[in-house]
């Protein structure tokens, strides 16, 4: 089959990293600089993706594979193939149209990206709050009071000096 196909189409013999050059009697020519072909039998090489500005080269282009971009420090990739770079925020913050803003009381974000999420409601699972939540961390739920045998003590954190989730300004 391969022999038959190559007799019909000489371009099928051109490997990845080359193209079938119609201007040179369908000879297999190497891809020019800044271009690639990832499969054999190509009649053209594709231009490489260029990572510039806020986009940073994660993987260089080669004759057989495209470049890959990520984002410069302080940004992270969004979208297919890292088509956007979104600004990082600190833990305990979320990105709004006006920049990074602290999580509201009762919410937290333990990452540099994404939105603030509500603390877990321990009582929905019949449990009690073992460790209070902050802007950066969810609450830790402990066993429900009913689960505690007589005489057993639950870990009670000291009362916070300020509302949990609020940092001093």
């Amino acid at each position: 089959f391969e022999r038959t196909r190559s007799l019909q189409d000489p371009c099928s013999n051109c490997p990845a990293g080359t193209f079938c050059d119609n201007n040179r009697n369908q000879i297999c020519s190497p891809c020019p600089p800044n271009s690639f072909s990832s499969a054999g039998g190509q009649r053209t090489c594709d231009i490489c993706r260029q990572c510039k500005g806020v986009f940073r080269t994660r993987k260089e282009c080669s004759s057989t594979s495209n470049a890959e971009c990520d984002c410069t420090p302080g940004f992270h990739c969004l979208g297919a193939g890292c088509s956007m770079c979104e600004q990082d925020c600190k833990q305990g913050q979320e990105l709004t149209k006006k920049g990074c803003k602290d999580c509201c009381f009762g919410t937290f974000n333990d990452q540099k990206r994404g939105i603030c999420r509500p603390w877990t409601n321990c009582s929905l699972d019949g449990k009690s709050v073992l460790v209070n939540g902050t802007k950066e961390r969810d609450v830790v739920c402990g066993p429900s009071p009913a689960d505690l045998s007589p005489g057993a003590s639950s870990v009670t954190p000291p009362a916070p000096a300020r509302e949990p989730g609020h940092s001093p300004q």
Epitope: Q50, K52, G53, V54, F75, S83, M84, C85, Q87
Partner: antibody
Amino acid sequence: EVQLVESGGGLVQPGGSLRLSCAASGFSLSTSGVGVTWIRQAPGKSLEWIGDIYHSGSTYYSPSLKSRVTISRDNSKNTLYLQLNSLRAEDTAVYYCAREGSDAVAGDWFDYWGQGTLVTVSS
Amino acid sequence: DIQLTQSPSSLSASVGDRVTITCRASQSISSYLNWYQQKPGKAPKLLIYAASTLQSGVPSRFSGSGSGTDFTLTISSLQPEDFATYYCQQYYSTPLTFGQGTKVEIK
């Protein structure tokens, strides 16, 4: 509020040079992730990218103009410049500067544009 | 260079019509495509970036779709202020390039 204001356009002799300015306000040219670009539009034609400069100072140019163009900036004045040499009739166009990115999301799109300045190359 | 070909070059439509403009790239550019609107004597205005993300402040009747080589800008219900010229732009590689434009005129 973000604003870009171009200046320096006018009538230029063929073979001459132009230096356009783009005064930016409402954001800093030296902020991480910020890029500013020059784009031109000949009368009745589409848009043509000339080149851009980033907060890091790195510049990128259109290969067709690279030998004649220089983009620079003055961070203290928050101003961008375009120098174009060996002018010819086909350089007649409205020249725009534009900010790249969009609020807290960065990329090679242009969210704020100046009003444009017309450059006419004629003897 | 990557060429962008828009179709149609111009179209006539009425207020309330659904309008679709296409942009075809000379090779795959993933989702690295933006759309702009330009009115006579004015600078272009960003509508859509990264193929489908609506720019802040742009009405939701505008939407973008596509990836690879074929992209679409759709105006779900044309308004009087939408009569303008629309351009696509790629940022896959330099030189950044624009389509030739599609002029949307009143029928």
